[in-house]
Interface confidence: low
């Protein structure tokens, strides 16, 4: 029989959980063979010397969400078997030197969501087997050189949500085994060249939500194994030509929410594994030829909410696998007829909230798999004959909020819309803007004879029928593009909670969670 403190529950004596506001000190006696101890949501304010002395077999210790503000240096004495220690979500401002001494088996140390203002090299000098160190959500302003020098086996380090303004180029120098480094939501304004040079096994680098203005040209040149690079929501105004040149494994790159004005050809790549590129909320004004040509496997390209007024005909060369293209909320007035010619696999395109006055008749000529086209809120008065005829998979077309000119020239479009009305959705239908006597009337049901009585109206629709009729039961599944719930940022797939916020803001990119990865 192994005793269980009255304030705790002991499931199979080796697992002990002590919770509740009535607990003000570490309960005793704890079962001597306890392997897992959780002390959660209590009013414990301090840990005295050696409160766990008699449970030397302990492997996991979680002391979380308490009022803990003070720990004696010998609090964890005799816990040589401990592999996991969490002190997260407490009120710790300082850590005594030597606190982790003797924890020779410790692999995971969680100190997140406290009020730590500094760490010192001596804090972790005994933790040579540590693989994971979580320090996010504290008040750290500076990491001293040498702080992590003894943690040569560390694979995951989270320093996010602190107040770091500067990172020493030496601070990560010994972390050759590090795979995940998170520095998101700090106040970093620049990162010295060489800072990441030693991180040859790094797979994820999170630098989003800082104040980084410039990136050194060779900043990532030694990080050949990098797979996920988050640079969103910074102040980056330009990308050095070679910045992404040696990242062959990269499969996610976020650059949204910066101040990028231009993208030079070849800036991206070669990145054969990159599937998504997020560039919305920048200041990009034009897209030159071949700017994305190295991204042969790219499936999602988000360029919305920029200031793009010109797209070179070869801008999308090489994007043969692209499925989603978001160009909404830019300053486009005209598009070259060949601009989408290479996008043979494109399924969804959003062009809403631009200034498009007309579209070339061949604009979608080679893009036979298009399922959704968003053209609402432009300056379109008419569309070329047969522009959608070959798009047999088209299931969502948005044309509202354009100044449609309902004269006799609109008839072919009107007749096609009549046959394909369900594709337009039920939320808002296109309405006439001119002539004045039909302004506000539905384009689909407008009587063109009333609008322009002097013009002869052919009795037979001149707009060819498409390959199928609007029988709603036969529509393809449109959930993947149903602009109902959208993301302001791609889901940055952290295992621990960081900064990702899902919102119902419909204005971001005209595509949905299903595409966000």
């Amino acid at each position: 029989y192994y005793g269980c403190p009255s304030e705790c529950t002991c499931s199979r004596a080796s697992q002990v959980e002590c919770t509740g506001a009535r607990i003000v000190a570490v309960p005793t006696p704890l079962p001597w063979n306890a392997m897992s101890l959780q002390i959660l949501n209590t009013h414990i304010t301090e840990l005295s010397e050696s409160p766990f002395l008699n449970i030397s077999a302990l492997i996991a210790l979680r002391i979380e969400k308490n009022e803990l503000s003070h720990i004696m240096p010998g609090a964890f004495r005799n816990l040589g078997s401990l592999r996991y220690l969490s002190l997260a979500n407490n009120k710790l401002q300082v850590l005594p030197i030597g606190l982790f001494q003797g924890l020779d088996s410790l692999e995971s140390l969680l100190l997140s969501s406290n009020q730590l203002v500094q760490i010192q090299p001596a804090h972790f000098s005994q933790c040579s087997n540590l693989k994971e160190l979580q320090l996010h959500g504290n008040h750290l302003e500076y990491i001293p050189d040498g702080a992590f020098d003894h943690l040569v086996g560390l694979t995951k380090l989270n320093l996010g949500k602190n107040s770091l303004t500067h990172i020493s180029p030496r601070v990560f120098q010994h972390l050759g085994n590090l795979q995940v480094l998170r520095l998101y939501e700090n106040r970093l304004t620049d990162i010295p060249m060489g800072t990441f040079d030693g991180l040859v096994n790094l797979q994820e680098l999170a630098l989003q939500q800082n104040q980084i203005g410039l990136l050194s040209p060779g900043l990532f040149h030694n990080n050949h194994n990098l797979q996920r690079l988050y640079l969103s929501n910074n102040h980056i105004s330009q990308l050095p030509p070679s910045i992404f040149m040696q990242l062959p494994q990269l499969n996610r790159l976020t650059l949204f929410g910066n101040s990028l004005k231009e993208l030079s050809p070849g800036i991206f790549g070669p990145m054969p594994n990159l599937r998504e590129l997020w560039l919305y909320d920048n200041h990009i004004t034009s897209l030159p030829d071949n700017v994305f040509s190295n991204l042969r496997q790219l499936q999602v390209l988000i360029l919305s909410r920029n200031q793009i007024s010109f797209i070179s005909p070869g801008a999308f060369n090489g994007l043969t696998e692209l499925r989603e293209l978001s160009l909404h909320t830019n300053a486009l007035q005209d598009l070259d007829g060949n601009v989408f010619r290479m996008l043979a696999n494109l399924q969804n395109i959003s062009l809403q909230n631009n200034r498009l006055r007309q579209l070339p008749g061949n604009i979608f000529a080679n893009v036979n798999g298009l399922m959704t086209i968003q053209l609402q809120n432009n300056q379109l008065e008419n569309l070329p004959l047969g522009i959608f005829d070959h798009l047999g998979k088209l299931c969502e077309l948005r044309l509202y909020d354009n100044p449609w000119r309902c004269d006799s020239d609109i008839l072919p479009l009107r007749n096609w819309l009549l046959l394909n009305q369900p594709r337009l959705g039920t939320d808002t239908v296109p309405v006439c803007f001119s002539p004045a006597n039909v302004r506000g009337q539905s384009l689909i049901i407008i009587n063109v004879n009333v609008a322009v009585p002097s013009v002869h109206v052919p009795e037979v629709p001149s707009y060819p029928e498409t390959s199928w009729y609007p029988d709603t039961s036969s529509y393809p599944d449109t959930t993947s593009i149903s602009s109902t719930t959208e993301l302001t940022s791609p889901v940055e797939d952290y295992t621990d909670l960081t900064t990702i916020q899902v919102t119902d803001d419909r204005s971001v990119w005209g595509m949905t969670q299903a595409q966000s990865g």
Epitope: D145, V152, H166, S168, P169, R170, Q173, H174, G176, P192, M193, G194, D197, G198, V200, N201, S216, G218, N222
Partner: antibody, heavy 116, light 107 residues
């Protein structure tokens, strides 16, 4: 006591490849970085590059196209190769322990002359 | 790359004199600066790192100061064994760069 010792030929012909090895004793090559630095007569010190025990490298851009540094952790050694040498590469070559910047231990240096 | 400019390029002083060498960086490097002493025919020796931290075993008459772009190495009382060339070195931003050196002689 940490010691570094350079070895390799003292004479190399123009257009050939200069090869040097640095043997580290008294310290594990698995900690810190390991650099090569050279000193040409009357020219001061020039950092060539460093290597990490994992194989990661960083080179001086002025030499990058010609230089390669490798590491052999089993022998506690690291090596320098400099291709297509000219007389301008004649110098004393030092290996040093690089604590990511400051070089706290240096080899004695070896003079390499490039001449036909 | 960061360029370090030392001044003077050479100086001559008497034993017991206070000697000052300056090093200016072409851009801010915080305190990531080291000083080395190289005696004739010998290997460079680390004197000071982090701009002002004395390396173990270095006599206390040597001191360093500065941050950003301007740095100083001071020998409070010059000794005969201090005859050498002194180099500053940037380690804020790779490539690591050295100043051109300051040669110190005894009058």
């Amino acid at each position: 006591q940490v010691q570094l010792q350079e070895s390799g030929p003292g004479l190399v012909k123009p257009s050939e490849t200069l090869s040097l090895t640095c043997t580290v004793s008294g310290a594990s090559i698995n900690i810190y970085y390991w650099s090569w630095i050279r000193e040409a007569s009357g020219k001061g010190l020039e950092w060539i590059g460093y290597v990490h025990h994992s194989g990661g490298t960083n080179y001086n851009p002025s030499l990058k196209s010609r230089v390669s540094i490798s590491v052999d952790t089993s022998k506690n050694q690291f090596s320098l190769r400099l291709k297509s040498v000219t007389a301008a590469d004649t110098a004393v070559y030092y290996c040093a322990r690089d604590t990511y910047g400051p070089f706290d231990y240096w080899g004695q240096g070896t003079l390499v002359t490039v001449s036909s | 790359e960061i360029v370090l400019t030392q001044s003077p390029s050479s100086l001559s002083a008497s034993v017991g004199d206070r000697v000052t060498i300056t090093c200016r960086a072409s851009q801010g490097i915080s305190n990531y600066l080291a000083w080395y002493q190289q005696k004739p025919g010998k290997v460079p020796k680390l004197l000071i790192y982090a701009a002002s931290t004395l390396q173990s075993g270095v006599p206390s008459r040597f001191s360093g100061s500065g941050s950003g772009t301007d740095f100083t190495l001071t020998v409070s009382s010059l000794q005969p064994e201090d005859v050498a060339t002194y180099y500053c070195q940037n380690y804020y931003s790779a490539p690591w760069t050295f100043g051109q050196g300051t040669k110190v002689e005894i009058k």
